[in-house]
């Protein structure tokens, strides 16, 4: 015998109190699959959360974070404070990036400026708290009389990583 509840579509529940009739989900509840015996309570996006998508009879509400915060985790389970560019979030709140580091986003940590010399290049534009340095051509390319044509790259010996 087929379970009569299996005929109940999403947005309804199988009401045992009414001879297993498919009843619509009550307000502020939903069922996202058929054959449900109960409807789930809709998530409420309050406080630090705000509603990104309203709850419907077939799908839960979706939250994001109020301005000044950003979502963490699947389904925006928590919110983390935003900082300004050029800052990072510490245990004592937002702090400016230390000299030699930058953060170009409202979240995340300050990262060290690129070391241009490791790539044999010079610094074209200095770094700031908000921006990484911009590396330019190698110092040799900038010397007077240097050819503007880039010479072919020398063949690398096996086992050596590129410069």
């Amino acid at each position: 015998l087929q379970d009569p509840c299996s005929n109940c579509p999403a947005g309804t529940f199988c009401d045992n109190n009414r001879n297993q009739i498919c009843s619509p989900c009550p307000p502020n509840s939903f069922s996202s699959a058929g054959g449900q015996r109960t409807c789930d309570i809709c998530r409420q996006c309050k406080g630090v959360f705000r509603t990104r998508k309203e709850c419907s009879s077939t799908s839960n509400a979706e939250c994001d974070c109020t301005p000044g915060f950003h979502c963490l985790g699947a389904g925006c389970s928590m919110c983390e404070q935003d900082c300004k560019q050029g800052q990072e979030l510490t245990k004592k709140g937002c702090k400016d990036c230390c000299f030699g580091t930058f953060n170009d986003q409202k979240r995340g940590i300050c990262r060290p400026w690129t070391n241009c010399s490791l790539d044999g290049k010079s610094v074209l534009v200095n770094g700031t708290k908000e921006r990484d340095v911009v590396c330019g051509p190698s110092p040799a390319d900038l010397s007077p009389g240097a050819s503007s044509v880039t010479p072919p790259a020398p063949a690398r010996e096996p086992g050596h990583s590129p410069q």
Epitope: F49, L72, M78, Q81, T90, K92
Partner: nanobody, 128 residues
């Protein structure tokens, strides 16, 4: 055994100040996001403020922003709520709550279902 014990409530005149404390025990305090929730007579719960496990992220309800300050001392396993410029509408029972999850050291939540543990509450009455 997990315990959250609030203290510091009382009767205060409008414009006055109080500092609530919540002493926690029985869990790794710094791993838990903490919150202060209040309930006035005949009204629903209102999330007043929340703070992440490491203390970097704080949230305040619009109704208390600029007047209340949440803080925590992880070395003392204690949560605080400094309440200044108190108003009659701040009269309520204040509860502290603790919840943990993957991001609770750096994030906050104002969803009551996130919080695993609740204190018994402390009464704050603002009246002249």
């Amino acid at each position: 055994e997990v315990q959250l014990v609030e203290s510091g409530g009382g009767l205060v005149q409008p414009g006055g100040s109080l500092r609530l404390s919540c002493a926690a025990s029985g869990f790794t305090f710094s791993s838990y996001a903490m919150g202060w929730v209040r309930q006035a007579p005949g009204k629903g719960r209102e999330f007043v403020s929340a703070i992440s496990g490491y203390g970097g992220t704080t949230y305040y309800a619009d109704s208390v922003k600029g007047r209340f300050t949440i803080s925590r001392d992880n070395s003392k396993n204690t949560l605080y709520l400094q309440m200044n410029s108190l108003r009659a509408e701040d009269t309520a029972v204040y509860y502290c709550a603790a919840g943990t999850g993957y991001y609770s050291r750096v994030g906050v939540s104002t969803d009551p279902s996130f919080y695993d543990y609740w204190g018994q509450g402390t009464q704050v009455t603002v009246s002249s």
